[in-house]
């Protein structure tokens, strides 16, 4: 097995990626400028910390979380970084074009970088379902399509349903999950004989995946509060997210032990279930009025996540060709739905408490918003999957799925690992 990049990809990837980067640089040159009105530099430097937290989540958290494959850990981390870097650039431009362009220039602020990082995070969640089965050229396509689809979804939801930044960005969990699952469904599924070991996890990569989970766990409150507009809402979001993820860790570890006949704890369950509370609480994190509610939500989310990790991989592996350790897709799809349902319940309580008959209308709109997110995710995911199947991308052969040696130079290694 040659450790060289296939010839065609070696020709295609640098040309494709560098041409795209040159195009992005030109777009930035002609259409963007920095916000020049920085009166209070000290305050703005402080607000950069939220953006920094998001970058840590994306680069280290999601980068390492997806690195548990025995023979695909390098690619997981580095490809994640590549997608993040590309995704942020395109997301800044796209958000600017969609929201500011009538004025002729896109003004880049710390907030626009924050938004762009969160948009790029969507791709990093989705890609968990396809990592190891695609090359970098294909991932570039996935980044461009998904960031574009999410940007347009957010714009449509904002205009039709009158939602703010936080609300329309919190559809990211459901959107990213369904996008990733629909892309995975389009890709070639069967693993030929003799390659099954490659999608198994190994101890050291699993440890790095746990490190990724820890980073995500630590910074999830920043993610859920990043787009909220007032200190009191942010405070609520941080507290509720913290309580939810704290309880989901306890639930994940004990639930994982409970689910095993010998009472052993599964690394895979824990990797994803520790984050369950943060996903489930995301949409309504600023609204939940007391800690016990956030904790109950964390408990329920942890149980759903462990249950899902136990019973869904078989189905996902058969139908979508997603390996057992890539459980972020179905995990986020279930937990994202749970979060949306909780929000709808809170909306109903608010309407009932206000004492008028608008409940059906409010619920209908919320369901419409959620349905739109899922439909756009599925449609754009299927479109991406079809695009990725085109011969021009020279996708890795099924026999070379989940193999770092297809993409990386390992001077100290022989042909095999």
């Amino acid at each position: 097995m040659s450790s060289k990049y296939p010839r065609s990809v070696r020709r295609c990837l640098p040309l494709w990626a560098l041409t795209l980067e040159a195009a992005l640089i030109l777009l930035f040159y002609f259409f963007t400028h920095y916000d020049a009105s920085l009166e209070d530099q000290k305050g703005l430097v402080a607000s950069y910390q939220v953006g920094q937290d998001l970058t840590v989540m994306a680069a280290i958290g999601l980068g390492f979380l997806t690195s548990s494959f025995r023979r695909h850990s390098w690619s997981s981390v580095a490809f994640n970084l590549f997608m993040l870097a590309l995704g942020v650039q395109w997301a800044i431009l796209l958000d600017g074009f969609l929201s500011q362009f009538p004025s002729g220039k896109v003004v880049i602020t710390l907030f626009s970088i924050r938004l762009a990082t969160m948009s790029a995070l969507s791709v990093l969640i989705s890609v968990d379902a396809v990592l190891g089965k695609v090359n970098l050229a294909q991932l570039v396509v996935m980044v461009l399509v998904e960031v574009t689809a999410l940007g347009n979804l957010r714009m449509v939801i904002s205009n039709i349903f009158n939602t703010d930044y936080h609300m329309n960005m919190m559809h990211i969990y459901v959107f990213a999950a369904y996008f990733g699952l629909s892309v995975a469904w389009c890709l070639p599924k069967p693993l030929p004989e003799g390659t099954e070991d490659k999608d198994q996890t190994a101890t050291i990569p699993s440890l790095s995946a746990m490190l990724g989970a820890l980073f995500l766990w630590m910074f999830w409150p920043s993610f859920n509060s990043a787009l909220l507009r007032s200190p009191i809402e942010r405070k609520n979001a941080v507290f509720n997210t913290y309580y939810a993820v704290a309880v989901s860790v306890v639930t994940a570890i004990s639930g994982s032990s409970l689910a095993h006949p010998q009472g052993k704890i599964s690394k895979t369950y824990v990797h994803s279930a520790v984050l369950a509370g943060g996903v489930a609480v995301g949409t309504s994190c600023h609204l939940i009025p007391s800690p016990w509610l956030a904790m109950v939500l964390g408990l329920v989310a942890g149980l759903i996540s462990v249950g899902g990790a136990k019973y869904l991989p078989g189905c996902c592996n058969r139908v979508l060709g997603i390996p057992h350790s890539s459980i972020m897709g179905y995990n986020f799809s279930l937990l994202g739905l749970l979060g949306e349902i909780i929000y709808i319940v809170l909306l109903v309580l608010d309407t009932v408490g206000a004492g008028n008959g608008m409940i059906g209308f409010q619920v209908l709109l919320s369901i419409g918003e959620l349905s739109l997110a899922i439909v756009i995710a599925l449609m754009s995911g299927l479109l991406t999957g079809l695009l990725l199947n085109l011969k021009i991308w020279k996708a890795p052969h099924e026999a070379k799925y989940f193999d770092d040696q297809v993409f990386w130079k390992f001077p100290h290694l022989a042909v095999g690992f």
Epitope: E39, N162, I232, D350, A354, F361
Partner: antibody, heavy 125, light 106 residues
């Protein structure tokens, strides 16, 4: 006592620039979103711009996008509105307003609970 | 969301019950505020979150509604209530105001 005091208004020619200030006192300025709202002679109120409590984000009405810039200096408890390429239709009384966020039954609600007295900007040749 | 107020103007007597309506083009939940504006003064907040009375506002003012239809009611009109009344949505940017209802005392 909460006070908002606008200044910097006056008569200016079309195409020129003007900078409005709003000095805040009596509350913790750095924890509130601040807005500019205007009222043209004989017309209704029109929202102009907002800046978030930490200055990280700004939003503008379509009519002023690309020409007006809102900013704040939390260390000086001051809000600003830089108005460039002024037009006759920008003639109005400009108010700064504080946005307070309050809990409804469950959802959060936003209200302009304090306003300044306004400063008149006249764009005329 | 565009806000349409009605009526454009109205004239009523002291002691009358007056109702002003505001209709939104989109669902704005309960994020609607009502202001009273007198010439030469700053606008004054009367009702926020559709039905909550702002501190210091007389109890004759009340608000109701949710979603797209809202009303401001003055239960017993007083001479000092002569002013222009605006509704305003604060759910999403750009914030918008209704065109105003001018209330005169007969």
């Amino acid at each position: 006592e909460v006070q908002l005091l606008e200044s910097g208004g006056g008569v200016v020619q079309p195409g020129r620039s003007l900078r409005l200030s709003c000095a805040a006192s009596g509350f913790t300025f750095s924890t509130y979103g601040m807005h500019w709202v205007r009222q043209a002679p004989g017309k209704g109120l029109e929202w102009v711009a907002v800046i978030w409590f930490d200055g990280s984000n700004k939003e503008y009405a379509d009519s002023v996008k690309g020409r007006f810039t809102v900013s704040r200096d939390n260390s000086k408890n001051t809000l600003y509105l830089q108005m460039n390429s002024l037009r006759a239709e920008d003639t109005a009384v400009y108010y700064c307003a504080r946005e307070e966020v309050v809990r409804g039954v469950i959802l959060w609600s936003r209200k302009f609970d304090y306003w300044g007295q306004g400063t008149l900007v006249t764009v005329s040749s | 969301a565009e806000l349409t107020q009605s009526p454009f103007s109205l004239s009523a007597s002291v002691g009358d019950r007056v109702t002003i309506t505001c209709r939104a083009s989109h669902n704005i939940y309960r994020s609607l505020n009502w202001f009273q504006h007198k010439p030469g003064e700053a606008p004054k907040l009367l009702v926020y979150a559709a039905s909550s009375l702002q501190r210091g506002v007389p109890t004759r003012f009340s608000g109701s509604g949710s979603g797209t239809d809202f009303t401001l009611t003055i239960s017993s009109l007083q001479p000092e209530d002569s002013a222009t009344y605006f509704c305003q949505q604060s759910v999403t940017f750009p914030y918008t105001f209704g065109q105003g209802t001018k209330l005169e005392i007969r």
